[in-house]
Amino acid sequence: SETTTGTSSNSSQSTSNSGLAPNPTNATTKAAG
């Protein structure tokens, strides 16, 4: 997917975490058994 940024916005980050995407992780699931 694609996200475009750089459009006008007056919103600001109010939480204590950065709003940038976190580091990628491999979401792997193991079958039970």
Partner: antibody, heavy 118, light 107 residues
Framework: QVQLVQSGAEVKKPGASVKVSCKAS????????MGWVRQAPGQGLEWMGE????????TFNQKFKSRVTMTRDTSISTAYMELSRLRSDDTAVYYC???????????WGQGTTVTVSS | DIQLTQSPSFLSASVGDRVTITCRAS??????LAWYQQKPGKAPKLLIY???TLHSGIPSRFRGSGSGTEFTLTISSLQPEDFATYYC?????????FGQGTKLEIK
């Protein structure tokens, strides 16, 4: 040690496209976003966008959205940035940079000079 | 978009001096400001992230402080290798934005 090695300098004519590569080593390529930043001669730094190497999700600066294509090949730990419909004001040094969530753009490639001239 | 304004744009100083560069954000970016050093013909190098955390291998004479909208980079005792251009960059939200740079020159 972390290393990002970029492809060599390019000279292009207006209207053409350029594709810059960035080969990563010394870390897990899929564990960090790869960003692209450019710097026109004598000017400051301008973020173009980034790609998630696992999902290929991209986030772009609006300014470049219609002209930039970011891809990656995880099998060779390499990211690519292609800029199309080149203009003279695209003449710049293009950098790839690893983005870590906590530390931001922590390691940079050496830069690729792209000259657009007729 | 967040805008970052650095001051001064140019700074002349001598070896051993203490210098301070300021970066102001147009809206709060919490603590998420990074500082980079760039020398001519070279890629930028990360010095400080999250406002005040020194990146690995960076000498302790570099110090970052601030939060919200006002941040400073202080170099406590200038060394010859510190003469370069310094950029701030917010890493709180997209789009990632850099300040316009501060060129630190030898007096």
């Amino acid at each position: 040690q972390v290393q990002l090695v970029q492809s060599g300098a390019e000279v292009k004519k207006p209207g053409a496209s350029v594709k810059v590569s960035c080969k990563a080593s010394g870390y897990d390529f899929t564990g960090y976003h790869m960003g692209w930043v450019r710097q026109a001669p004598g000017q400051g730094l301008e973020w173009m966008g980034e790609i998630n190497p696992i999902t290929s999700d991209k986030t772009f600066n609006q300014k470049f959205k219609s002209r930039v294509t970011m891809t990656r090949d995880t099998s060779i730990s390499t990211a690519y940035m292609e800029l199309s419909r080149l203009r003279s004001d695209d003449t710049a040094v293009y950098y790839c940079a690893r983005r870590d969530y906590g530390t931001s753009l922590d390691y940079w490639g050496q830069g690729t000079t792209v000259t657009v001239s007729s | 978009d967040i805008q970052l304004t650095q001051s001064p744009s140019f700074l002349s100083a001598s070896v051993g001096d203490r210098v301070t560069i300021t970066c102001r954000a147009s809206a709060s970016i919490s603590k998420y400001l990074a500082w980079y050093q760039q020398k001519p013909g070279k890629a930028p190098k990360l010095l400080i992230y999250a406002g005040s955390t020194l990146h690995s291998g960076i000498p302790s004479r570099f110090r970052g402080s601030g939060s919200g909208t006002e941040f400073t980079l202080t170099i406590s005792s200038l060394q010859p290798e510190d003469f370069a251009t310094y950029y701030c960059q917010q890493h709180n939200e997209y789009p990632i934005i850099f300040g316009q740079g501060t060129k630190l020159e030898i007096k």
